[in-house]
Interface confidence: medium
Amino acid sequence: ACDTATCVTHRLAGLLSRSGGVVKNNFVPTNVGSKAF
C-alpha cells in the first residue's frame, strides 16, 4: 500500500471531504510533508 506523505495526506483529505470537513490554508489537521518530489 502507498504510505508516502502524499498518499496519507490525500486519504485524509478524502475522509474529511466525505465527512463534510473543511480544510483551510492555515489549518493543518495532521502531519504531512513530502509529496511528489
Epitope: T6, C7, T9, A13, N31, V32, G33, S34, K35, F37
Partner: antibody, heavy 122, light 107 residues
Framework: EVQLVESGGGLVQPGGSLRLSCAAS????????ISWVRQAPGKGLEWVAE??????????HYAEAVKGRFTISRDNAKNSLYLQMNSLRAEDTAVYYC?????????????WGQGTLVTVSS | EIVLTQSPATLSLSPGERATLSCKAS??????VSWYQQKPGQAPRLLIY???NRYLGIPARFSGSGSGTDFTLTISSLEPEDFAVYYC?????????FGQGTKLEIK
C-alpha cells in the same frame, strides 16, 4: 514567511562523520513530514531520508545508499531537523537540501533550503 | 525502486518555441509525479504537482499531463528564463525517486 536554513556542511575525510542541521521558521514545524535531498556536483537530485511528524512518532525512511550510516532526527522544541552522517564516502559528496512538501487540498506548500555542501575527500 | 527515465537528455530550442519533455516510470505511480526546474547554484523550484497541477505563481505556459507511467511537461512558448534543467519525481512509493533530468538549452 517559511524559511529553511541548512548548516553544518564542510570538508570531511572518508570514514568520518558530520552532522547537518536545518533551522525551520514560519510554520508549525512539529506537524510536518520533512526530508533531506542531495545533489552531487554536476549530477541530479537524490532523496536521502524523511522523518514524519511528532504525531506519527517521528518515524523515518531512508534511501538504500545511506541506510545504516545516516540518521535523520528532529527537535520540535528547537524547530530543527538534523542529519547525522557516519562512515562517509566520496560518493556522499553533494549539496544537501532540507525540503518541506505539503499537499492538502488548496494548501499546497513547497519549500527548500539553500543547501549546504558536504565534501568527502582525503 | 521506481525508475524515472526522462527524454531527451538535452533539448535545444529557441525562445518562442514549444518544449515537450517526457518522463516514463518503470512502475505505475498514478498521478503522483511532480516537475521541478533548477538553475545553476539554486535549489529546485516546483512547477507541477499531481502530474497536472501548476504550483503557486507558476506561469500558464507550463503544463503537465499524464497518468500511470507516462508523463509530459510542456512549455507552450519558451521565455529566456526557461532555459534550465528539468526533473520529474515520483512520490508514490519509497524511495522517492527523480529522473536524471532534461537540460533545456538555447539553440
Amino acid at each position: 514567511e517559511v524559511q529553511l536554513v541548512e548548516s553544518g556542511g564542510g570538508l570531511v575525510q572518508p570514514g568520518g562523520s558530520l552532522r547537518l542541521s536545518c533551522a525551520a521558521s514560519g510554520f508549525t514545524f512539529s506537524n510536518y513530514w520533512i526530508s533531506w535531498v542531495r545533489q552531487a556536483p554536476g549530477k541530479g537530485l537524490e532523496w536521502v531520508a524523511e522523518i514524519r511528524s511528532e504525531s506519527d512518532a517521528s518515524a523515518t525512511h531512508y534511501a538504500e545508499a545511506v541506510k545504516g550510516r545516516f540518521t535523520i532526527s528532529r527537535d520540535n522544541a528547537k524547530n530543527s531537523l538534523y542529519l547525522q552522517m557516519n562512515s562517509l564516502r566520496a560518493e556522499d559528496t553533494a549539496v544537501y537540501y532540507c525540503r518541506l512538501y505539503f499537499d492538502y487540498g488548496l494548501a499546497i506548500q513547497n519549500y527548500w533550503g539553500q543547501g549546504t555542501l558536504v565534501t568527502v575527500s582525503s | 525502486e521506481i525508475v524515472l527515465t526522462q527524454s531527451p537528455a538535452t533539448l535545444s530550442l529557441s525562445p518562442g518555441e514549444r518544449a515537450t519533455l517526457s518522463c516514463k516510470a518503470s512502475k505505475w505511480v498514478t498521478t503522483y509525479v511532480s516537475w521541478y526546474q533548477q538553475k545553476p547554484g539554486q535549489a529546485p523550484r516546483l512547477l507541477i504537482y499531481g502530474a497536472s497541477n501548476r504550483y503557486l505563481g507558476i506561469p500558464a505556459r507550463f503544463s503537465g499531463s499524464g497518468s500511470g507511467t507516462d508523463f509530459t511537461l510542456t512549455i507552450s512558448s519558451l521565455e529566456p528564463e526557461d532555459f534550465a534543467v528539468y526533473y520529474c519525481s515520483q512520490s508514490y512509493n519509497y524511495p522517492y525517486t527523480f529522473g536524471q533530468g532534461t537540460k533545456l538549452e538555447i539553440k
